[in-house]
Interface confidence: low
């Protein structure tokens, strides 16, 4: 039977923060300033992510891994790998196409990011407000009415502003 | 080694217009942010903004953003800057200079010998 | 943007001996790994030249008699001893954001 021929790929050999290098014969030669190869075998770099304008720099960029950017001061990250910024706004308000509006009547946030939410509905769950809410924080809800008679315990934990396993970026 | 080269001098009318020109060698243009720097006589130093050749990417410094207009040619590895309805506050020395890679952050390595932009009647 | 104020404006010095320019800005300009700040030697009718990189790193070329210290919003250009080349104006400039910008210039005079 014949023999299949394997001739190994001499850019196989060039390690991460290299690339293989056609002009010069294949051989390795090292990433060029502001680019990185973080896998071996590549025949060229990437250029390294650049954190301008609102964007900064969180990890440099090396020859073997991008850069990573946050966001400057009143912004915050959005989107995977921090893709764009985002304004932040004062807790009790939200971002709007007009900028930063405060919450309506019956509605908080206690981040600087994100929408407003409404009052958590203490009736639903069979209690009264013990604490009333504001543009930035939830109502507490405090015991049933029927729970105030005397002997009672006055206050019950209130409930979380948040659903289990919600917390801000 | 690497050069940025630009015209000396140019003399423009008031209310008109002007391209400036930067021809860069020995690096890879594209690879690099070029920005612009305004030097009026005897005094300081501003920063007019930057554009990435790979991706036509700019910034600008709020004051220059009617102003000025960052654009290259990669075939001849050159930066423009065009200045519009210019007045005598315009006249100045125009530098344009390379930046340096580290991160996402640069210092300003390599400089042109800048060209006199003269306003007059 | 960040305002860097650099002092003095001028600043005599006799040969030999050291020259202290500072800058600083108004809000911080450094992490943990680095200072974004950078230093310009500019003399009549010559483009900058860069001396200084991330605060304390000579770019290369540049005499040792040059150096730069500090981190945060202070900065300092020190030069000793002064020899006559010096002659110059010094600039302060900061990447940390756009837009860049620059101190008002330090001219350095021997005396």
């Known amino acids: 039977f014949e023999r299949t021929r394997s001739l190994q790929d001499p850019c196989s050999n060039c390690p991460a923060g290299t690339f293989c290098d056609n002009n010069r014969n294949q051989i390795c030669s090292p990433c060029p300033p502001n680019s990185f190869s973080s896998a071996g075998g590549q025949r060229t770099c990437d250029i390294c992510r650049q954190c301008k304008g609102v964007f900064r720099t969180r990890k440099e960029c090396s020859s073997t891994s991008n850069a990573e950017c946050d966001c400057t001061p009143g912004f915050h990250c959005l989107g995977a790998g921090c893709s764009m910024c985002e304004q932040d706004c004062k807790q009790g308000q939200e971002l709007t196409k007009k900028g930063c509006k405060d919450c309506c009547f019956g509605t908080f946030n206690d981040q600087k990011r994100g929408i407003c939410r409404p009052w958590t509905n203490c009736s639903l769950d069979g209690k009264s407000v013990l604490v009333n809410g504001t543009k930035e924080r939830d109502v507490v809800c405090g015991p049933s009415p029927a729970d105030l008679s005397p002997g009672a315990s006055s206050v019950t934990p209130p409930a979380p502003a948040r659903e289990p396993g919600h917390s801000p970026q | 080694q690497v050069q940025l080269q630009q015209p000396e001098s140019e003399l423009v009318r008031p209310g008109g217009s002007v391209k400036l020109s930067c021809k860069a060698s020995?690096?890879?243009?594209?690879?690099?942010?070029m920005d612009w720097v305004k030097q009026r006589h005897g005094q300081g130093l501003e920063w007019i903004g930057n554009?990435?050749?790979?991706?036509?990417?700019?910034n600008y410094a709020e004051k220059f953003k009617s102003k000025a207009t960052l654009t290259v040619d990669t075939s001849s590895s050159t930066a423009y800057m065009h200045l519009s309805s210019l007045t005598s506050e315009d006249s100045a020395v125009y530098y344009c200079?390379?930046?340096?890679?580290?991160?996402?952050?640069?210092?300003?390595?390599?400089w042109g010998q800048g060209t006199l932009v003269t306003v007059s009647a | 943007d960040i305002v860097l104020t650099q002092s003095p404006a001028s600043l005599p010095v006799s040969l030999g001996q050291r020259a202290t320019i500072s800058c600083r800005a108004s809000?911080?300009?450094?992490?943990?790994?680095?200072?974004?700040m950078h230093w310009y030697q500019q003399k009549p009718g010559q483009p900058p030249k860069l001396l200084i990189k991330?605060?304390?790193n000579l770019e290369s070329g540049v005499p040792a008699r040059f150096s730069g210290s500090g981190s945060g919003t202070d900065f300092t250009l020190n030069i000793h001893p002064v020899e006559e080349e010096d002659t110059a104006t010094y600039y302060c400039?900061?990447?940390?954001?756009?837009?860049?910008?620059f101190g008002g210039g330090t001219k350095l005079e021997i005396e």
């Open positions: 200079t390379r930046e340096e890679a580290l991160g996402g952050y640069y210092e300003l390595t390599y």
């Open positions: 020995g690096y890879t243009f594209t690879s690099y942010w």
């Open positions: 554009i990435y050749p790979d991706s036509g990417g700019t």
């Open positions: 809000q911080s300009v450094s992490t943990s790994s680095y200072s974004y």
């Open positions: 991330y605060a304390s």
């Open positions: 400039q900061h990447s940390w954001e756009i837009p860049y910008t």
